[in-house]
């Protein structure tokens, strides 16, 4: 790391080290030999989250309901607003600037992980012995019915999209 001219939480201006403004405040005027750095608190709906020499605070993020967004955590003078998505939707990026509807898992696929406000549904193909016959954002793959436990026999084999069909035992068999 290269050497720095100033202490931590200071900056160099006009060959002199001045104190940075603390989080939640913006720079009004640099220090001089006789005066300290002048800082002012950020206004309503503004923030600065680091020690800084910014002359303008950043605007809080707007969680636009038209994009499916809502406020997860209200911003302060030191933190930005955190947006999340309405129920049934998830963010399209880490910054959560817009939302998309949770994906449904097609027949033959089940839900491995239910979607959250920030991640989409994760689907997995139904393995042998399991099926899903619906398009759903919640349903897991279901196990095929066990005909034997019902004293029945398999009349039609199951697939990844259909359950087995059970029927009565063939009484003519010895």
């Amino acid at each position: 790391e290269p050497p720095t001219a100033c202490r931590e939480k200071q900056y160099l201006i006009n060959s002199q080290c001045c104190s940075l403004c603390q989080p939640g405040q913006k720079l009004v005027s640099d220090c001089t030999e006789f005066t300290e750095t002048e800082c002012l608190p950020c206004g309503e709906s503004e923030f600065l989250d680091t020690w800084n020499r910014e002359t303008h605070c950043h605007q809080h993020k707007y969680c636009d309901p038209n994009l499916g967004l809502r406020v997860q955590q209200k911003g302060t003078s030191e933190t930005d607003t955190i947006c999340t998505c309405e129920e049934g939707w998830h963010c399209t990026s880490e910054a959560c600037e817009s939302c998309v509807l949770h994906r449904s898992c097609s027949p033959g696929f089940g839900v491995k992980q239910i979607a959250t406000g920030v991640s989409d549904t994760i689907c997995e193909p139904c393995p042998v012995g399991f099926f899903s016959n619906v398009s759903s954002a919640f349903e897991k793959c279901h196990p095929w019915t066990s005909c034997e436990t019902k004293d029945l026999v398999v009349q039609q084999a199951g697939t990844n999209k259909t359950d087995v069909v059970c029927g009565p035992q063939d009484r003519l068999r010895a």
Partner: antibody, heavy 126, light 107 residues
Framework: QVQLVQSGAEVKKPGASVKVSCKAS????????MHWVRQAPGQGLEWMGW????????NYAQKFQGRVTMTRDTSISTAYMELNRLRSDDTAVYYC???????????????????WGQGTLVTVSS | DIQMTQSPSSVSASVGDRVTITCRAS??????LAWYQQKPGKAPNLLIY???TLQSGVPSRFSGSGSGTDFTLTISSLQPEDFATYYC?????????FGGGTKVEIK
């Protein structure tokens, strides 16, 4: 009362490393930058760098960049200075020196040393 | 880096004399300057900081003045215990730099 007690004298061969310790007592260790200053025999004072014991942040003089490492152990209020790849011209008395309290200074770096360790003589000789 | 030039490099004086040491910075350092006294085999001792503020416990015969690039340390009436080497140090920006020292010797 404030005291900075340094480790004892060291004799090292060229190319070796040395690690000097500086144990602080009598004040809040984390509240003051600790600097290291050296003085070659019969010569003046040379600033090496500082460590902020609170954050662990460091700042080294360009001359020592890549060769010096300053660390601290706040649990025992001790600062360390390690110098690698020693040369004969590194023979000097090494001092730790306490800075003004953090937050004392708003303009300038205001690094004035009100307390010093007793010094550690490091001799580099083959 | 800011260069600090001290003069003279040595001065011979008698007890009771007024001694003046100067320090010049290669660029303006406002009032961010300190003066130290060092005796043989000992660590330096802070005398003055921010160019003119006397460190607690330092006798009032020591005084400092100046700002910008030119600074002065004055010992108004030299005492036997004042025979030592004196260093100036700029505290405006890192890297901190010291003057080459002024040795005050007995005439």
């Amino acid at each position: 009362q404030v005291q900075l007690v340094q480790s004892g004298a060291e004799v090292k061969k060229p190319g070796a490393s040395v690690k000097v310790s500086c144990k602080a007592s009598g004040y809040a260790f984390a509240g003051f930058y600790m600097h290291w200053v050296r003085q070659a025999p019969g010569q003046g004072l040379e600033w090496m760098g500082w460590i902020n014991p609170d954050s662990g942040g460091t700042n080294y003089a360009q001359k020592f960049q890549g060769r010096v490492t300053m660390t601290r152990d706040t649990s025992i209020s001790t600062a360390y200075m390690e110098l690698n790849r020693l040369r004969s011209d590194d023979t000097a008395v090494y001092y730790c020196a306490r800075d003004q309290p953090l937050g004392y200074c708003t303009n300038g770096v205001c690094s004035y040393f009100d307390y010093w360790g007793q010094g550690t003589l490091v001799t580099v000789s083959s | 880096d800011i260069q600090m030039t001290q003069s003279p490099s040595s001065v011979s004086a008698s007890v009771g004399d007024r001694v003046t040491i100067t320090c010049r910075a290669s660029q303006g350092i406002y009032s961010w300057l300190a003066w130290y006294q060092q005796k043989p085999g000992k660590a330096p001792n802070l005398l003055i900081y921010t160019a003119s503020t006397l460190q607690s416990g330092v006798p009032s015969r020591f005084s400092g003045s100046g700002s910008g690039t030119d600074f002065t340390l004055t010992i108004s009436s030299l005492q036997p215990e004042d025979f030592a080497t004196y260093y100036c140090q700029q505290a405006n920006i890192f890297p901190l730099t010291f003057g080459g020292g002024t040795k005050v010797e007995i005439k």
